[in-house]
């Protein structure tokens, strides 16, 4: 296993619709053809997997049908979008990149993007 640098923004504020997008960029030392990207969430010292996708270079990222993540790739950049976020989902989202094929296997883990989610204010009751 060889180490690889992964860069991601330090902080992002999700949209009022609970959508957060950020780029995860990795310094590929070679010509990988198969890449696996995993998004981890760290909160209260607990780390959980949010979503993961394996893709062939030049192809779209394919997450599971029920995943809250979507993404696109371009060169050594992966543009990740996480949707359906609520205030309780605020936390540190870490991008993990693995170059699966061809060997050697490379692993890179970013410092994390602190995503803040603000629940929209409830609309005031209106009399008709």
């Amino acid at each position: 296993c060889k180490a690889m640098h992964v860069a991601q923004p330090a902080v992002v504020l999700a949209s009022s619709r609970g959508i957060a997008s950020f780029v995860c960029e990795y310094a590929s030392p070679g010509k990988a053809t198969e890449v696996r990207v995993t998004v981890l969430r760290q909160a209260d010292s607990q780390v959980t997997e949010v979503c993961a996708a394996t893709y062939m270079m030049g192809n779209e990222l394919t997450f599971l049908d029920d995943s809250i993540c979507t993404g696109t790739s371009s060169g050594n950049q992966v543009n990740l979008t996480i949707q359906g976020l609520r205030a309780m989902d605020t936390g540190l989202y870490i991008c993990k990149v693995e170059l699966m094929y061809p060997p050697p296997y490379y692993l890179g883990i970013g410092n994390g993007t602190q995503i803040y989610v603000i629940d929209p204010e409830p609309c005031p009751d209106s009399d008709f």
Epitope: P9, A10, V11, L13, A14, S15, S16, T90, D119
Partner: antibody, heavy 116, light 106 residues
């Protein structure tokens, strides 16, 4: 090294607007947020809101909603805070700061005086 | 909005003594920071995430607590530690500050 340099002191009349700038250097501007905090003379700190320089999304204090606008110019690594319909109780030192989980780097502060 | 109440309002201590500052929230808080401010200066971040020390902060400063009760402890007061200390919650919008605790020389 990380630096945040704010625009100079302003004197405004009630009802006017003020726009304070905050020029960042020494780091990747779009990777961080910019938070705005003010402090009235002899008083404590008041959070005004923040902007994600990465995507331009904003989160404002409820009491200032409708009067405040925070923006960024990523080409010059500068953040702006505009406050409209100024009142005498808006007289304060206005600080910008680099935000992630708390403000680790601060501007020097901009004194805004609202007086007729 | 979450109201943060700091106590005591003023703490009179001598250099070398231990300082314990309290910050109580009106409802549960998930993220809390502590700042130090000296007259005529911008605040300085000491602690984020309730217990993580910011870069360059001496280890005599420590933060603890969760939920609604948080504490900033200065194990041995140095002359430069006499200042006003603020807590800030940033887990629930609007983010809010406490009213501050002044640590003065006895």
């Amino acid at each position: 090294q990380v630096q945040l340099v704010q625009s100079g002191a302003e004197v405004k009349k009630p009802g006017a607007s003020v726009k304070v700038s905050c020029k960042a250097s020494g780091y990747t501007f779009t990777s961080y947020g910019i938070s705005w905090v003010r402090q009235a003379p002899g008083q404590g700190l008041e959070w005004m809101g923040w902007i994600s320089a990465y995507n331009g999304n904003t989160n404002y204090a409820q009491k200032l909603q409708g009067r405040v606008t925070m923006t960024t110019d990523t080409s010059t690594s500068t953040a702006y805070m505009e406050l409209r319909s100024l009142r005498s109780d808006d007289t304060a030192v206005y600080y910008c700061g680099r935000w992630v989980r708390g403000v680790e780097y601060w501007g020097q502060g901009t004194l805004v005086t609202v007086s007729s | 909005e979450i109201v943060l109440t700091q106590s005591p309002g003023t703490l009179s201590l001598s250099p070398g003594e231990r300082a314990t500052l309290s910050c109580r929230a009106s409802q549960s808080v998930s993220y809390l920071a502590w700042y130090q401010q000296k007259p005529g200066q911008a605040p300085r971040l000491l602690i984020y995430g309730a217990s993580s020390r910011a870069t360059g902060i001496p280890d005599r400063f420590s933060g603890s607590g969760s939920g609604t009760d948080f504490t900033l402890t200065i194990s041995r007061l140095e002359p430069e530690d006499f200042a006003v200390y603020y807590c800030q919650q940033y887990g629930s919008s609007p983010w809010t500050f406490g009213q501050g605790t002044k640590v003065e020389i006895k």
